[in-house]
Each structure stands twice: as structure tokens, then as C-alpha cells.
Amino acid sequence: TLQMGFPVITVDTSTGTLSQEHFLLDPDSNVTRPSEFNYVWIVPITSIRDGRQQQDYWLIDVRAQNDLFSTSGNEWVLLNLNVTGYYRVNYDEENWRKIQTQLQRDHSAIPVINRAQIINDAFNLASAHKVPVTLALNNTLFLIEERQYMPWEAALSSLSYFKLMFDRSEVYGPMKNYLKKQVTPLFIHFRNNTNNWREIPENLMDQYSEVNAISTACSNGVPECEEMVSGLFKQWMENPNNNPIHPNLRSTVYCNAIAQGGEEEWDFAWEQFRNATLVNEADKLRAALACSKELWILNRYLSYTLNPDLIRKQDATSTIISITNNVIGQGLVWDFVQSNWKKLFNDYGGGSFSFSNLIQAVTRRFSTEYELQQLEQFKKDNEETGFGSGTRALEQALEKTKANIKWVKENKEVVLQWFTENSK
């Protein structure tokens, strides 16, 4: 493309009309950079109607009409077959509803990559205020029958923002219940197809999907998942020289077993981390140690990060970030950063400590006026010390917090109601 960005193609299936516009995630943003092409693209339109591929079409204007894209009765149309074009697609309300019906009745009529596209496009269109957030959420209902990696990954990555915004609020209970309901069949599918987790799926995508199934099932309270990871970890604790956990599953099993466990599990993992000879294995354990749900354990771990004899200096930032990614550790790290900024800056300012990543991570969940105030105060209090590589990140964090506040205000009530109704 010879101009910035990409288009969203809007389809009106009642008339067969296509239109294109420059896709902007933030509808309030102004594009100041002019384009000699006026943000109009030549778009290759591939499509399927009711599961059957149609002839290709080129959209060369802002608007065009073609009977390829008009439907009647229960027919639906889907654009950008196998996502070969770099554009998003929005439909009229009726076509969205028909696509959702098709997905829930027989999702195999829609190619796997398009099932992911439908989810991803809808969440982005909701962010851009083009469709209601409930439409994007409705597009995840079919996942109860989905076994493929890409659609699940599209949903989980979109919902990760919802988790960040709501995992400290009353929305999180119904959200967890919904995800638990949706992921349980996927979890059982992999349990049955891997001889109770003793084998690994042959297909690489299925291997990824298995990891998603375990991490989503465990983090959303599927009891059998919690028992499975705790059991595997206990086996390892009983025989430390023989790790029974397949390398594919280690990150997620370690993390969830430590989250479920207490001091004993944590201390064992710490010991294994200290004795690890493979960097890869050490990194998995170091990240998993931040998964504990015990505040005092996380606090102790946080203190370890500033002791180079325990955590290497070059690993300090990523370890602190792992702790802040844990909702229980987030407040802890923010207090720590506010109280120790001067020391952090003076001790680590010249080295590999990434202030930018740290500020970005510790403020990711910020979505209240109080947190915005705290952030502004933090900026004011440390102006003299400075923020080094984190200066730009701090400005971005202030902007992002404002955007988060606005998003939560707009969506919290709707999302709470939707998850409550759909987790039954």
C-alpha cells in the first residue's frame, strides 16, 4: 500500500453495496497526514455466499454495487476469503446475525481463518464504534464447538483487554464463568485425544491449541484442569530429577500449579530455577514464580528482583513485569515503583533495565480517575529525577489511562449484563 493504514469494507447485503473508508481504531482521532490517494484503496474482494466461493471482484471506488453481495432469505455473504486481503470487513446487522447463526449451527461452512477474522474484525469494529460490543461478544458464542487454534486465539487475545479492564471488578466473575463454560469442551477434547495429557498432538496448531485450552481452563476455574496441573507438579516435586511435564506444557502448568499452590510449591520452583542449566527452562520458571496468589510471596519475589545475586540484572525488568501482569501483584508493583523510582532510576538507569516496558506494564490496568490522578502525581513527583527511556511511555500511559476510563464507562454495564446472561 502506498498510503498509511488500511480500509474497512462495509457491506450492505440488502442492496449489494460495498463502501470503503480508512479504518481508525479511535473514532475521535484526526488524520493530519494527507494522502495523494485520499485514503481510497484498490481492494481485491473475495467472497463466499452460504459457504460457496464466488467470483473475485475489484473495488476501485469509495462505493460500488454488485449482486454478488446482495442476499435474500437466510443467505449470508462473507468477504475476504482466507484473509488474503489487508482490510477489515463490516456487515449490515442482518448479515452479522446470519453469520452468527451459521457459526453456531455449523461453523465448518466458514474457513477456519475466516472464523478468526470474524472475531478479530468485530472486536476492532466495536472499539471503533462501528458495531455494538455485544455483537463482538456474540461472535464468540460458537467457540463452545470450536477446536481449532486460530479462532480461539483471536477471541482470547481480544478478550485479554476485557480481562485487564475488569479483573478487579464485579464483571470478572461472570466473565470467568462464561469462559469456563466455553473452554470446557476444548479442554475435554484435548484430554481425550492425548491419552490424559500423556501424548502431544501431532499437528503444530493443535499443540498451540492444547496450551490455550489448559491455560484458559485453569485460569477460569475448570476443576479438572486445576487437579491436572497440581497433580503433574506434585509428581515432579516427589521426583525432582524426572520432570513429567512435557516441554510444550511447562509454562502453563508451572504457572497454574504455582497459582494453585502455596509456599511449598513456590519454594520448590525457586529451587529448580536456581539450579536450572537451560536458559529456556529458567525463563519459564522465572515467569511462573510470578503466578502465585499469595501477596506475601509476590512481595518477597519483588524484593528478590533487586538483588543481582538472586535475579540477574538483565532479568529484573521482565521479572517485575511478570509480577505486575498478575492482578494480585499489580498494586504491589505500582506501590513499589512509586516508592522506589529514584533508587530504581539511579541504580539501573545506565543498564539494561527497561523503564519504558515497566511503565507500560504497571499501568496497563489503569482505568479509574483515581489511577489517573496517581499517575499524574507520579509524573510530577519525579520530574527532577526523570524517566529516561520511560519518558514517552509515561505520556502514552496517561493517554491510554484516559482511553481506558472512557471505554470502561461506555462498556462496563453492557459487558456485565452480557457475561451474566451468557454464563448460565
Epitope: D92, E93, H129, T134, V414
Partner: nanobody, 128 residues
């Protein structure tokens, strides 16, 4: 700040027609369901018609069915109520309302009295 401004009311003879408009501002109009309610003197506010966010779902009260048509223009942030074959019993103040909780429009049927976002009313009088 969500704002709704209804207009188009007036005095009309029985059998006549009126078209009410309601302009929305301060919110993402195109992702909300919109509806019309009315309140006759001494009576409770009652549901008249509703339309989903994209316009493909419409709902009517029994008294409005066949005579009234609800439509919307998302480009103009406006919802309309075309009223034909008006009767004296249609005399009321007509209010428009917005609902983001159920963008498909069914919220107006289930819990019309719980809608938070009401517009200013417009008076419709049907009399000879």
C-alpha cells in the same frame, strides 16, 4: 453526555399523518437501539416502537402495528416515527429513548420503564 431531542409533533385531524424525528448526540448513536414511547394525560408511559442498532429489527406495540413505522438514519444520528391513520387515542406526549444494553432492541419490550436515556417529549394531538 447523552442527549435526545424529539420534534415533529403537532395538531392533526383523525386519519391524518405525522412524522416524528429524534436527533441523538453525545453518544455512539449507531450502536444503540432506539425506541419511541408515549404518555397520555393521566396515564403511564407506554411503549410504541423500537428499532435495533442497524435497523433490521423493528418492534411495535399492538396499537402501533400496521399504522406506525419506525426507521433510523445512522449517518444523521436520527430515528423517525412515521404515524399514519392517526386516532384521537394517539394523543399523547411522545418521547424517544436510547438503549445500549440491548442493541437488538428487545430491551424496550422487556424493561421499557428502566430505560435511562429519555429525550424531551413532543406533543401529538389528534382532534377534529
Amino acid at each position: 453526555q447523552v442527549q435526545l431531542q424529539a420534534s415533529g409533533g403537532g395538531l392533526v385531524q383523525p386519519g391524518g399523518s405525522l412524522r416524528l424525528s429524534c436527533a441523538g448526540s453525545g453518544f455512539t448513536f449507531s450502536t444503540y437501539a432506539m425506541g419511541w414511547f408515549r404518555q397520555a394525560p393521566g396515564k403511564e408511559r407506554e411503549f410504541v416502537a423500537a428499532i435495533s442498532w442497524g435497523g433490521s429489527g423493528t418492534y411495535y406495540s399492538d396499537s402501533a402495528k400496521g399504522r406506525f413505522t419506525i426507521s433510523r438514519d445512522n449517518a444523521k444520528n436520527t430515528v423517525y416515527l412515521q404515524m399514519n391513520s392517526l386516532k384521537p387515542e394517539d394523543t399523547a406526549v411522545y418521547y424517544c429513548a436510547a438503549d445500549k444494553l440491548r442493541p437488538n432492541g428487545t430491551g424496550f419490550l422487556a424493561r421499557g420503564t428502566m430505560i435511562e436515556t429519555w429525550g424531551q417529549g413532543t406533543q401529538v394531538t389528534v382532534s377534529s
